[in-house]
């Protein structure tokens, strides 16, 4: 299954105390998927998209993360044939530093 797209949601954090918001989006033909956010290979959070939506926003509270952040990846899972769960490839990484540089 194709990897999801990932992005850091603005406003970007300026310190370790600020929350981090990360959006993850599956391809258009996978609405209602279950999403997992990883940090350094460890599961950080799980969210299910609404049945009519392709993605979710993970909200990580400030101070809960080791600095500097990342890399974050996300992944989604869907039920395939015979109700077996199928996992996507991992997204590209997103790194968070403080303050986050603007492009």
């Amino acid at each position: 299954i194709p990897a999801p797209s990932i992005r850091l949601v603005p406003p970007y954090p300026s310190s370790q105390e600020d929350p981090i918001h990360i959006a993850c989006m599956a391809p258009g033909n996978f609405p209602g998927a279950n999403f997992t956010l990883y940090r350094g290979g460890q599961v950080v959070q799980l969210l299910q998209a609404p049945t009519d939506q392709r993605g979710v926003t993970f909200n990580l509270s400030g101070g809960s993360s080791k600095a500097p952040g990342g890399p974050f990846h996300c992944q989604y899972g869907v039920l395939g044939e015979l109700n077996q769960s199928q996992l996507s490839d991992l997204s590209e990484p997103v790194n968070v530093s403080f303050p986050v540089p603007t492009w």
Epitope: S5, R7, V9, P11, Y12, G28, Q53, T102
Partner: antibody
Framework: QVQLVQSGAEVKKPGASVKVSCKAS????????MHWVRQAPGQGLEWMGI????????NYAQKFQGRVTMTRDTSISTAYMELSRLRSEDTAVYYC??????????WGQGTLVTVSS | DIQMTQSPSSLSASVGDRVTITCRAS??????LNWYQQKPGKAPQLLIY???SLQSGVPSRFSGSGSGTDFTLTISSLQPEDFATYYC?????????FGQGTKVEIK
Amino acid sequence: QVQLVQSGAEVKKPGASVKVSCKASGYTFSGYGMHWVRQAPGQGLEWMGIISPSNGNTNYAQKFQGRVTMTRDTSISTAYMELSRLRSEDTAVYYCAREVYYGLDVWGQGTLVTVSS
Amino acid sequence: DIQMTQSPSSLSASVGDRVTITCRASQSISSWLNWYQQKPGKAPQLLIYGASSLQSGVPSRFSGSGSGTDFTLTISSLQPEDFATYYCQQYISIPITFGQGTKVEIK
């Protein structure tokens, strides 16, 4: 339904400041960032910045750094954009727009700011 | 900043025509691309998000495709209410940037 209602048109003199408001309804105001985008007459869309209503964090476009201030009042579900040291080139329609995981989904009706001596 | 280049800047078409507008990003933006429609004196309205998903309430004659740097908005059969200006927008990173717009006019 989700709605963003902006304040009315303003006429300002060069050098003055303007403060535009954007009142949100139909959703949890503190759960979504608020963008500001402007559009000069006959021109395209230009992003100005974003504020997080939950904690007041902001990111501003470099072009407006030092001249723009975005604030919010969560008690009345309202975001504000103040632009100072106005010049004629700031004549534009200013829009607020809600941030969701897939971008900017709902926009205010726009506020025309005219800068003229 | 990521530059967004739309083409054409304007086009003339008739009701029933198939219309295609393209948008190119100066670097990869994955699928983080939206298309908006704007009519004179009105705010932009979201048509397509995530490059290919139809926003709720938008007619199915609108479709979007692409990923990475090249994207397309297609109107399969142009209707009178579709004459407007269309903008692409990237939102993978700030500053969020828009294409310069494509004005669809009546031939």
